[in-house]
């Protein structure tokens, strides 16, 4: 789980070691702060749990792509 060391900076110290179905993911945010030990992605699930994931993993990239497509507004 993400840790807020000094709000508002949230850092991840461990990553999930399992894929999470993309259908369970609601949104994500990237963690790039120099105050954090590693770059990370924090996914928020449909039941509002927050999960730290490794942005280098393919499933994480696929999930972010999927969520990006989902949130794009349709062109008229």
């Amino acid at each position: 789980q993400p840790d807020a060391i000094n709000a508002p900076v949230t850092c991840c110290y461990n990553f999930t070691n399992r894929k999470i179905s993309v259908q369970r993911l609601a949104s994500y945010r990237r963690i790039t702060s120099s105050k954090c030990p590693k770059e990370a992605v924090i996914f928020k699930t449909i039941v509002a749990k927050e999960i730290c994931a490794d942005p280098k993993q393919k499933w994480v990239q696929d999930s972010m792509d999927h969520l990006d497509k989902q949130t794009q507004t349709p062109k008229t």
Epitope: N17, R18, K19, Q23, R24, V47, I51
Partner: antibody
Framework: QVQLVQSGAEVKKPGASVKVSCKVS????????MHWVRQAPGKGLEWMGG????????IYAQKFQGRVTMTEDTSTDTAYMELSSLRTEDTAVYYC????????????WGQGTLVTVSS | DIVMTQSPDSLAVSLGERATINCKSS????????????LVWYQQKPGQPPKLLIN???TRESGVPDRFSGSGSGTDFTLTISSLQAEDVAVYYC?????????FGQGTKVEIK
Amino acid sequence: QVQLVQSGAEVKKPGASVKVSCKVSGYTLTELSMHWVRQAPGKGLEWMGGFDPEDGETIYAQKFQGRVTMTEDTSTDTAYMELSSLRTEDTAVYYCTTDDFWSGYFDYWGQGTLVTVSS
Amino acid sequence: DIVMTQSPDSLAVSLGERATINCKSSQSLLYSSKNKNYLVWYQQKPGQPPKLLINWASTRESGVPDRFSGSGSGTDFTLTISSLQAEDVAVYYCQQYYSSPWTFGQGTKVEIK
């Protein structure tokens, strides 16, 4: 395509334990979240527990807590379900089942393992 | 925990007639941002594992005949077999996958009248 192959039927005495295996092929076990569902004769489907990646741990149905242990051997891509202190009402077919990254629901099932508990 | 309640427990329908099974959840299975209901329907025949028929409450799995349809949203769902065939005799289950623990309905047995 995921394939799940379970161990064979077992006959156990009340009070004993049983360990059912589920061998994964087509994917590695660490890419999946394995769950176990049982079905007593003439009864419905009952979720027993499984790996919840949102919590990062295996979770169990309250009914089975303390009696069931679900483990994995990632070197052989095999999942195990051990049920202890068996009673006659544990006689059932036990299924392993898993979801797919793109689906989120149980779309792959093992063939089932019949466990008979009888004195 | 989310409780899933199916009705009826069993029904007998003539060949070629419509069969309707209802499933009610104790809380909403709709995630509105995705506009998806986290509910599936399974068919189970004796000695076989459950077979997935419908996902997302209304999407037929590949290879499932179009006489099977799913509808509903939120807490109330329906599986309809528009024209019952002999091979449809089975037990049907709904299951939610919105939040753990995953829960099933008690099942509905469909027979031929």
